[in-house]
């Protein structure tokens, strides 16, 4: 969370701003926040890059201008209008590319004066493990299977019985690169498993972390995803 | 010294539509949005919808979806809020407002009363 | 959709004495609260928006404050014209929701 203020004569405006994460091919959003104001046609949003010249963005009497654009953004980017009334400043970007991550500016100028904060965008992949009881293999085993991460994550094995347990002996894990020849495809096998237990599969970069879990007894199994952000504000 | 007009009391049957407006005069008509709040007798204040002409967007409680449609004339600095399918729990005091996100400036109000 | 809550419902003060009215949102509404005030008879009147900010010709006397989802508009010392009812109302989110209000009257 980053709070950034502006100074235009005697007057300031608060802008926010959040960390965040964009994932790769999908559409992201910066987030940034600010006073409102009720004269709506004075409001001029401003989304500036680091190292770039021209714009990210620029929103203002009601619209979009984008006349200063940097190419790089070219159609992939709009502003929540309705959401500028509620003082949201948040940028919409679609198709994230690796590129798109650096430190932006959100600047603010309102009738009540101005303001600006930076927010840091990270970009990589991520993506939900789902896991599986793995019946071809020659003793009962686990594969958690996750389509898309980038940078290469680190992947680790738990287990609600044996806690604290190391499993990186019995467990086997590869990265096979995608197609765009950018994210991997995360695949890892846990071997020797036992029933009525929960296992779990956690898969980790510096951007996001995700769980898998799953639950085999003899009548059934039970399966959990859950995917976080890491450093988001 | 921003003034906003209201059109007169009206009595309605129930089933018809109203049909309320607002004159503006004092400030940019289009650099504002324009809410409708109502008032039942004896009751607090209900935001209805409003309308930002500098955005051309409109958005309406959900409470009235289908029921409300507000429109501006930038050219007569002029709103308008029709309400169809009128029944008696419609009875309210009218109010137009400079606004959102929150309200400066308020009509006198128009008295709507649905009767049969 | 952000439920707002007031109280009291009515809060009997006398004139000099300060009053203390509150506003409760079901969500954080950060600073995107505004409050009203309304005699019978006429029109809502804008007294205070962005939490603590007093609009174009409201008294001193008249404070907000809060944040998140707690808010309170103090009034320091009550004069007759201070009488009426008054409404809190978010615009973090559409759509914009006021309080049920709380009547302020004279003991």
């Known amino acids: 969370l980053i709070i950034g203020f502006g100074i235009s004569g005697k007057h300031f405006i608060t802008v926010t701003t959040f960390t965040s994460a964009g994932n790769i091919g999908e559409d992201g959003t910066l987030s940034c926040t600010f006073e409102p104001d009720i004269k709506l046609n004075g409001i001029v949003i401003q989304w500036l890059k680091e190292g770039i010249k021209g714009l990210v963005h620029e929103f203002k009497e009601g619209k979009d201008d984008l006349s200063q654009q940097h190419e790089m953004f070219r159609g992939r980017t709009a502003v929540f209008a309705d959401q500028v009334v509620v003082g949201n400043a948040s940028l919409r970007l679609k198709n994230v590319q690796l590129t798109d991550a650096g430190t932006y500016t959100c600047y603010i100028r309102t009738s009540k004066g101005k303001g600006n904060a930076n927010l840091e965008y990270k970009t990589g992949a991520f993506s939900m493990p789902e896991i599986n009881v793995d019946y071809n293999a020659s003793s009962e085993s686990l594969r958690c299977e996750a389509p898309r991460w980038f940078p290469q994550p680190t992947v680790a094995w738990a287990s609600q019985v044996d806690q604290g347990a190391n499993f990186s002996e019995v467990s086997n894990t590869s990265f096979e690169l995608n197609s765009e020849n950018v994210t991997m495809k995360v695949v890892s096998v846990l071997y020797n498993v036992t029933i009525n237990n929960t296992y779990s599969c956690m898969i980790e970069n510096d951007i996001a972390k995700a769980t898998g879990d799953i639950k085999v007894t003899d009548s059934e199994v039970k399966r959990r995803s859950q995917l976080q952000l890491l450093n988001s504000g | 010294q921003v003034q906003l007009v209201q059109s007169g009391a009206e009595v309605k049957k129930p089933g018809s539509s109203m049909k309320v407006s607002c004159k503006a005069s004092?400030?940019?008509?289009?650099?504002?949005?324009i809410s409708w709040v109502r008032q039942a007798p004896g009751q607090g204040l209900e935001w209805m919808a409003g309308i930002i002409p500098v955005f051309g967007t409109a958005h309406n409680a959900q409470k009235f979806q289908g029921r409300v449609t507000i429109t501006a004339d930038k050219s007569t600095s002029t709103a308008y809020m029709e309400l169809s399918s009128l029944r008696s729990e419609d009875t309210a005091v009218y109010y137009c407002?400079?606004?959102?996100?929150?309200?400066?400036?308020w009509g006198q109000g128009t008295l709507v009363t649905v009767s049969s | 959709e952000i439920v707002m809550t007031q109280s009291p419902a009515t809060l009997s003060v006398s004139p000099g004495e300060r009053a203390a009215l509150s506003c409760r949102a079901s969500?954080?509404?950060?600073?995107?609260l505004a409050w009203y005030q309304q005699k019978p008879g006429q029109a809502p009147r804008l007294l205070i928006y962005?939490?603590?900010t007093r609009a174009t010709g409201i008294p001193d006397r008249f404070n907000g404050s809060g944040s998140g989802t707690e808010f309170t508009l103090t009034i320091s010392s009550l004069q007759s014209e201070d009488f009426g009812a008054y409404y809190c109302q978010q615009y973090k989110k559409w759509p914009f929701i006021f309080g049920p209000g709380t009547k302020l009257e004279i003991k």
């Open positions: 962005g939490v603590s």
């Open positions: 969500q954080s509404v950060s600073s995107n």
């Open positions: 407002t400079r606004g959102g996100p929150y309200f400066d400036y």
């Open positions: 004092g400030d940019t008509f289009s650099s504002y949005a």
